[in-house]
């Protein structure tokens, strides 16, 4: 019978050896067989499973000139950059006729310095705030024990004592470095060094101190900043979006914020050039040499109403006998609030001033007392908001009505018996 066809007679004359080494090692397993007739294809098994994508080469050398003579077949399996997944029992397998032959096993083992699966990462933390760092390593050989170091100082007396995969740091007051040593029986591997930058804590208690129509004074309590003094705080204000505005805690407003820097201390800032009677959202962050704190949540605030900045415009006053007709237009200057109405004052040369609240109308007919012979009658008008009266207009003299002028019909306003209030405005 041809060589290799009997079950008890293996064609293998050389079996795979053993390889044990560290990660990254390159090695070769080799098996050799002698067969009669056409050389078979040699397959490689790892832990009993055929390796479909094995990096193997097969060399065949005839021992005679006839095809039916014996052949020496050598198969070499190359393992490049040894990894944990490469470890196991390796065998060669051939099919000869109707029989399957498997070589004696060789073993590939991994043994070397620990290998990091996870290393501590750089991060920023607020001063005195707890955080965790992670480190994970594996052999073989196992066990792998970790030793954490802070600023190159070991945090335990030896590897395996103290924290292992997760290091809980209760808080830092200065920027520090952390690394992790992984130890096993073969030696030590050191992780990357993570820099933990200590930033100031988020400021607290952002609040309004005082309000004016165009400025807000705000104050806050700084957070701890470790050994690094705060250099400044930054305050941002943004117009709220017509009632749809940003909620407290929303990350970013829809438009570019107005940004102001405050020297510290004091932890207080006057924000000027604001619009009166306008909702804003404000927030603050404080900065040390290490960087800025996180922003506070957005705080909704509102500037108060102001008085109108200008008098009503285009005032005209005409007189016809005992009646006077006055009309005007809304001030062009900013109202700084909600217009609640107009006040009108008139006075003759030798008569007391009469003050009237006209409401939101922009015209009025006055019923003058007497026969209308009061001389040099003048009228002033002011607009007002909830914050008070705006500036009064300059006195407008009452002109006599000339035939041909339109005389609109108006509700008559009787002069009050006593002036509501009076002030010396001319």
């Amino acid at each position: 019978a041809p060589r290799g066809t009997q079950a008890e007679e293996s064609p293998f004359v050389g079996n795979p050896g053993n390889i044990t080494g560290a990660r990254g090692l390159t090695g070769t397993l080799r098996c050799q067989l002698q067969v009669q007739g056409e050389p078979p294809e040699v397959h490689w098994l790892r832990d009993g499973q055929i390796l479909e994508l094995a990096d193997s080469t097969q060399t065949q050398v005839p021992l005679g000139e006839d095809e039916q003579d014996d052949w020496i077949v050598v198969s070499q399996l190359r393992i490049t950059s040894l990894q944990l997944s490469d470890t196991g029992q390796y065998q060669c397998l051939v099919f000869l006729g109707h029989q399957t032959f498997v070589s004696q096993p060789g073993y590939v083992g991994l043994e070397g310095l620990p290998y990091f699966l996870e290393e501590p990462e750089d991060r920023t933390v607020a001063a005195n705030t707890p955080f965790n760092l992670s480190c994970q390593a594996q052999g073989p050989p196992e066990p792998v024990d970790l030793l954490w170091l802070q600023d190159a100082v070991p945090l335990a007396t030896a590897p395996g004592h103290g924290p292992q995969r997760s290091l809980h740091v209760p808080g830092l007051n200065k920027t520090s470095s952390f690394s992790c040593e992984a130890h096993n029986a073969k030696g030590v591997t050191t992780s990357r060094t993570a820099t933990i930058t200590v930033l100031p804590q988020q400021p607290r208690n952002l609040h309004l101190v005082s309000r004016q129509p165009t400025e807000l004074e705000v104050a806050w309590t700084p957070g701890l900043s470790g050994i690094y003094p705060l250099t400044h705080c930054t305050l941002q204000a943004v117009l709220s979006d017509d009632g749809m505005g940003i909620q407290a805690g929303e990350p970013d407003p829809p438009e570019e914020p107005l940004t102001s820097q405050a020297s510290v201390p004091p932890h207080q800032l006057r924000l000027g050039s604001l619009h009166p009677h306008t909702p804003y959202h404000i927030r603050v962050a404080c900065t040390s040499s290490q960087g800025p704190s996180s922003w506070t949540h957005w705080l909704p605030v509102e500037t108060p109403e102001g008085v109108p900045l200008g008098p009503p415009e285009n005032i005209s006053a005409t007189r016809n006998g005992s009646q006077a007709f006055v009309h005007w237009q809304e001030p062009r200057a900013p109202l700084q609030g909600t217009l609640l109405g107009y006040r009108l004052a008139y006075q003759g040369q030798d008569t007391p001033e009469v003050l009237m609240d006209i409401g939101l109308r922009q015209e009025v007919t006055l019923e003058l007392q007497g026969d209308g012979s009061v001389s040099n009658l003048t009228v002033c008008v002011a607009a007002y908001t909830a914050a008070g009266d705006g500036p009064w207009s300059l006195p407008v003299p009452l002109e006599a009505w000339r035939p041909g002028q339109a005389q609109p019909v108006h509700q008559l306003v009787k002069e009050p018996s006593t002036p509501a209030f009076s002030w010396p405005w001319w």
Epitope: V153, T157, A158, N184, A185, G187
Partner: antibody
Framework: QIQLVQSGPELKKPGETVKISCKAS????????MNWVKQAPGKGLKWMGW????????TYADDFKGRFAFSLETSASTAYLQINNLTTEDMVTYFC???????????????WGQGTSVTVSS | DIQMTQTTSSLSASLGDRVTISCRAS??????LNWYQQKPDGTVKLLIY???RLHSGVPSRFSGSGSGTDYSLTISNLELEDVATYFC?????????FGSGTKLEIK
């Protein structure tokens, strides 16, 4: 918790041999080296050497080469100090102290046995 | 061998005092300096390793400082249980060497 318990006091004659034991508990014995330290009455501490509990390999300080031998019984988590040919100079207290990790002795001796006093008298 | 020198062999202090014990190495020991406490009954404990790191269970009134060749151990608020002899030890180079010890007593 980690403990090192040493054998009791010994009374020996000059020329005899003494073997002191140090039983460890509360940690993986083979991971951490074992140091031996000598203290003469009223005197300071003197490091004698250490044994790698993983490989069994001893390292002796110069003054303790020859008559002194460190050994292990790993299955019992026990280290031994044997002193041959005792003299009155050996009449001191001996401490075992857990120390270096595997083959690295630089770690501090973080746990100590209670000490074993040896008396040498004819 | 590296020589470790503790110049003060004994010192006496009152309860509540701040006590400092010093130790000098004959050459730079790269911060591998440990402090041990030996109680009158002979038991030895590690107090501080790597200059200033407290071993687990050691009260925070103990602290260490120094660099290069000069190191010190400070007890900030002396208590009765601190009566002991204190040894420094270098762990930088074999053979390990100890200082001669400083015996601390209560006045």
């Amino acid at each position: 918790q980690i403990q090192l318990v040493q054998s009791g006091p010994e009374l020996k004659k000059p020329g005899e041999t003494v073997k002191i034991s140090c039983k460890a508990s509360g940690y993986t014995f083979t991971k951490y080296g074992m140091n031996w330290v000598k203290q003469a009455p009223g005197k300071g501490l003197k490091w004698m050497g250490w044994i790698n509990t993983y490989t069994g390999e001893p390292t002796y300080a110069d003054d303790f080469k020859g008559r002194f031998a460190f050994s292990l019984e790993t299955s019992a988590s026990t280290a031994y100090l044997q002193i041959n040919n005792l003299t009155t100079e050996d009449m001191v207290t001996y401490f075992c102290a857990k120390g270096g990790y595997y083959s690295n002795p630089i770690y501090p001796m973080d746990y100590w046995g209670q000490g074993t006093s040896v008396t040498v008298s004819s | 061998d590296i020589q470790m020198t503790q110049t003060t062999s004994s010192l006496s202090a009152s309860l509540g005092d701040r006590v400092t014990i010093s130790c000098r190495a004959s050459q730079d020991i790269n911060n591998y300096l440990n402090w041990y406490q030996q109680k009158p009954d002979g038991t030895v404990k590690l107090l501080i390793y790597y200059i200033s790191r407290l071993h687990s269970g050691v009260p925070s009134r103990f602290s260490g400082s120094g660099s290069g060749t000069d190191y010190s151990l400070t007890i900030s608020n002396l208590e009765l249980e601190d009566v002991a002899t204190y040894f420094c030890q270098q762990g930088n180079t074999l053979p390990f060497t100890f200082g001669s010890g400083t015996k601390l007593e209560i006045k």
